[in-house]
């Protein structure tokens, strides 16, 4: 059967009819559904959530919806014994505490199980020392600290400001650095746009607002008990002792009220430059300890949390394909939220049960997508994508011979200013396409496409007249699915203007003024960036779901390697004397690249040359086009870091949320100059260009002519 | 055979502007990436701009960042130079020239045969 | 100025060898493909060499290119009247993402 054939309609009229069934008024009353109570993973109130989509998504068509299960570590306050921090005097008094829960906004007083602000997975103790102000606590943060300045934060209690790279990889750092507890707190500087009210009259963060969030160094490995494997009933768990990615010190977070009492009296070092200032009135000293008349005074941090298995629940849907059934097309976001989660994630959970309903109603009718698509509402995201990694484990093996794509659907909006686009470069020229035919929702763009409102907001810094498209890192529920599987990802949302807001995240994020109003009232109240998301995310699905030909271009592959092998020779040459010394080159790379360059553009000839009408052939180019991104998988991962497999993107090792490219060899180079075996040192970097150069040519090889 | 044949060029006053056009035949044009070269009277060649194969991802020469604009229409095999700003400096002979190996440049298997661009008052 | 530095000129009798020294840097030559073009008076630049030193089909074996560390060679044995001509090194560099040539030398057939 053609596709024509399978799917009744012709295929532009397929994707019109699609998208002309999205409606901004639905995605509206689907967010508002989902915000009204919390829906913390492990609850009964994420369960029936999940049950309650399950029973919609029957209703809009899909061929079959189903919960699965698992058992996996979670986090979670203890309700008789709170957390908190104290500073005490001399004599062991508390004479002040921090607060214990969030002042909950207007209208929602009364509602219950509103988790107070924690760290999940944080240790229990009740460590107490001088502190010491760490900054954003990043590595250059540490090396600036400990190097520069002398400063020894052993036996201290780091307090950190929120924002620029993963809370996880600011424990980290600091566990490294000696540290006996971890602060966290939202400096205004970051979370506070200036010019705008805290919420409930703005969309800033008040002075009692705390972000939540999990700690950990998981490293893509899923349930920290059951890494490689899926938590199901016969799993064999580790004991804690041996759990991945849990942090060893206690960490608490904390809103910028109670950051103002501890900073107010820091002594010690004053900060080394501007760079290290945010905006409370204090004086930003670095320390150890508290100034002259409140020498005396210690910190102490107060963390009952426990952590326990408990149950979770994904909802995955399927839309039988009508030609190649056993090719998926994933869309995938989660459910769970910290507290209400206005933004994150019900703004995308809304905008994918709307995409669901489109997809069902053109079912109705009598259409088929070419391939199946797989919808996942995910589960246990917020500690430590648990949900999508868990079930990805579990099907790997159908995954890795089927997978075509996943696309990602966690919050539609961080901001209303344009969009914001991560993914393979696979799909570039899918995004470029797309977003082309789409009209832009943004102020002065009216009649104009999204693609020229995007590239005017946001250029390309390195290809004039395209608009920016970000490498994938992590923090999301596409993780598993690119850096371990190998399978071609993307996600797209609505962003803010980068150039003049400096806060990291939405001002909001992970706190309890997250609801509905915060969306409706400040962000989109004609929730027309919403559906703007609906369209690109739906769109990139339906693509590559009905497509003849998968809508993948080889040669964009060839241009970044080129980029990324010119950015890391770069990195390295910085170090010329060390490379003539252990004779380190590029060349083997240079060359793989050069030959994937070459066989990349002779199969894109082929490919539009072949008989399309020939189903082998087809089939044959299409799993060419699929299994690419599979190739840059090397299965014995990066180098202590097993579940992350792509030799080209990983999450960099210190800021989870951002990608690198050529991981293997940029950590192999970083900070290389401080390496006491620098032998050693230097022949790992030759080692991971090997790897990387293997991997180029290998992938490249698989689009030769197979025969 | 693979032809490529440029035009637009002429006589333009110092920051007036021109678009030079290459039409191209013979290969999958999309699967290659296409660079404008110059030579100035006498002297030696310039690279200028490239665009690569696939979506069209753009590299200037210093000398002309932000005033020239490379582009391409892969359905009508055609590439094009827009140049504002125009200096006297940029009087030359255009050269359109396709890539040998694919979507990023690495050498220049076949070339133009020019067209000369003056910059006077 | 170009960042690959040839020598202006070089001349030989007919039936000699001349070679012409192309001149860069690590992020140049030192690890890139080097390519040559000969530009007869008047005509468009032909490639003469690529890949440091294969041939495209049509150009005689009396043309060859060699690259060590950061230079590269082009050599012309045989000469002959209609070898007279500018000739350009050519590579990308890694560190403009931009292709660079040489400053060209010109090859003048004496007698």
């Known amino acids: 059967k053609s596709s024509s054939e399978a799917t009744n309609i012709t295929p532009k009229h397929n994707m019109k009819a699609f998208l002309d069934e999205l409606k901004a008024e639905n995605i509206k009353k689907f967010l508002h559904n989902f915000t009204q109570i919390p829906h913390l993973a492990g609850t009964e109130q994420n369960f029936q959530l999940a049950k309650q989509i399950q029973s919609q998504w029957k209703e809009f068509g899909l061929d079959s919806v189903e919960l699965t299960h698992y058992d996996v570590l979670l986090s979670y306050p203890n309700k008789t014994h709170p957390n908190y921090i104290s500073i005490i005097n001399e004599d062991g008094n508390e004479i002040f505490n921090t607060s214990l829960f969030e002042p909950p906004p207007a209208g929602y007083e009364n509602v219950s199980d509103i988790v107070p602000p924690f760290s999940a997975f944080s240790p229990q103790g009740m460590p107490e020392g001088d502190l010491v102000y760490v900054n954003y606590a990043r590595t250059e943060d540490f090396f600036k600290l400990e190097r520069d300045m002398k400063i020894n934060c052993s036996g201290k209690i780091v307090i950190a400001r929120y924002g620029k790279v993963f809370r996880g990889n600011k424990v980290k750092n600091a566990q490294l650095a000696g540290a006996t507890g971890v602060i966290l707190y939202s400096d205004p500087d970051d979370y506070f746009a200036p010019g705008v009210k805290s919420y409930p009259d703005g969309w800033n963060l008040p002075g009692g607002g705390v972000q939540r969030g999990n700690i950990l160094n998981l490293n893509g490995a899923g349930d920290p008990l059951t890494p490689g494997y899926p938590a199901n009933e016969y799993a064999y768990r580790r004991g804690m002792a041996e759990a991945v990615g849990l942090p060893s010190i206690p960490v608490h977070p904390i809103g910028y009220y109670d950051a103002q009492k501890l900073l107010e009296k820091m002594g010690g070092s004053a900060s080394p430059d501007s760079s290290w200032r945010g905006s409370l009135k204090v004086p930003y000293n670095v320390g150890p300890g508290f100034t002259g008349n409140f020498s005396t005074q210690k910190v102490k941090m107060h963390i009952h949390s426990t952590s326990e298995v408990t149950r979770i629940y994904n909802v995955i849907g399927t839309l039988r394909g009508a030609v190649e059934p056993d090719r998926y097309v994933i869309l995938g976001g989660h459910r769970d939220s910290w507290v209400f989660g206005g933004i994150d994630p019900q703004s995308g959970a809304a905008v994918v049960h709307e995409i669901v309903r489109s997809f069902g109603m053109l079912k109705k009718e009598g259409w088929r997508p070419r391939r199946t698509i797989l919808f996942a509402s995910w589960d246990a995201e917020e500690f430590g994508l648990l949900g999508s990694t868990e079930w990805a484990e579990e099907n790997s093996r159908l995954l890795q011979e089927r997978g075509v794509a996943y696309i990602n659907a966690d919050s539609s909006i961080e901001g209303n200013y344009t969009l914001r686009v991560d993914c393979t470069p696979l799909m570039y020229s899918l995004v470029y396409n797309l977003t082309k035919e789409l009209e832009s929702p943004d102020e002065g763009f009216e009649g104009k496409s999204l693609y020229e409102s995007w590239t005017k907001k946001s250029p390309s810094p390195e290809f004039s007249g395209m608009p920016r498209i970000s490498k994938l890192g992590s923090g999301n529920d596409f993780e598993v699915f690119f850096q371990r599987l190998g399978i071609a990802s993307g996600r797209a949302r609505y962003t803010k203007n980068w150039e003049t807001n400096k806060f990291s995240s939405y001002p909001l994020y992970h706190s309890v003024y997250e609801t509905y109003e915060l969306v409706e009232k400040f962000y989109d109240p004609m929730f027309k960036y919403h559906l703007t998301v609906a369209q690109v995310r739906g769109g990139m699905v339906f693509e590559l779901a009905n497509s003849v030909v998968l809508p993948f271009d080889c040669r964009d592959y060839a241009v970044v390697l080129r980029k990324y092998a010119d950015k890391i020779y770069n990195i390295s040459m910085k170090h010329p004397q060390e490379m003539k010394t252990y004779s380190v080159s590029f060349d083997s790379l240079f060359s793989a690249v050069k030959n994937f360059t070459e066989i990349a553009s002779k199969f894109s000839e082929r490919l539009r040359d072949f008989d399309k009408s020939n189903p082998i052939l087809l089939r044959m180019m299409n799993d060419q086009l699929m299994f690419l991104e599979r190739a840059f998988i090397d299965p014995l991962g990066l180098p202590d870091r097993p579940f992350y497999r792509h030799v080209i993107y990983a999450p960099s090792s210190h800021n989870k949320y951002a990608g690198e490219s050529f991981p293997g060899i940029y950590d192999a180079l970083f900070d290389i100059e401080s390496k006491v075996d620098p032998s050693q040192a230097w022949g790992e970097v030759k080692r991971q260009i090997s790897i990387a150069t293997f991997t180029v040519q290998a992938a490249a090889e698989t689009l030769s002519e197979v025969a | 055979e693979v032809q490529l044949v440029e035009s637009g060029g002429g006589l333009v006053q110092p920051g007036g502007s021109l678009r030079l056009s290459c039409a191209a035949s013979?290969?999958?044009?999309?699967?290659?990436?296409m660079s404008w070269v110059r030579q100035a009277p006498g002297k030696g060649l310039e690279w200028v701009s490239a665009?690569?194969?696939?979506?069209?991802?753009?590299y200037y020469a210093d000398s002309v960042k932000g005033r020239f604009t490379i582009s391409r229409d892969n359905s009508k095999n055609t590439l094009w130079l827009q140049m504002n700003s125009l200096r006297a400096e940029d009087t030359a002979v255009y050269y359109c020239?396709?890539?040998?190996?694919?979507?990023?440049?690495?050498?220049?298997?076949?070339w133009g045969q020019g067209t000369l661009v003056t910059v006077s008052s | 100025q170009s960042v690959l530095t040839q020598p202006p000129s070089v001349s030989a009798a007919p039936g000699q060898k001349v070679t012409i020294s192309c001149s860069g840097s690590?992020?140049?030559?030192?690890?890139?493909?080097v390519s040559w073009y000969q530009q007869l008076p008047g005509t468009a630049p032909k490639l003469l060499i690529y890949?440091?030193?294969k041939r495209p089909s049509g150009i005689p074996d009396r043309f060859s290119g060699s690259k060590s560390g950061t230079s590269a060679t082009l050599g012309i044995t045989g000469l002959q009247t209609g070898d007279e001509a500018d000739y350009y090194c050519?590579?990308?560099?890694?560190?403009?993402?931009?292709?660079?040539f040489g400053t060209g030398t010109k090859v003048t057939v004496l007698g």
């Open positions: 020239a396709k890539d040998g190996v694919g979507a990023t440049p690495y050498y220049f298997d076949y």
């Open positions: 013979g290969f999958t044009f999309s699967s290659y990436a």
């Open positions: 665009i690569s194969g696939g979506i069209g991802s753009t």
């Open positions: 690590s992020s140049n030559i030192g690890n890139n493909y």
């Open positions: 890949d440091n030193n």
């Open positions: 050519g590579t990308w560099d890694s560190s403009l993402s931009a292709y660079v």
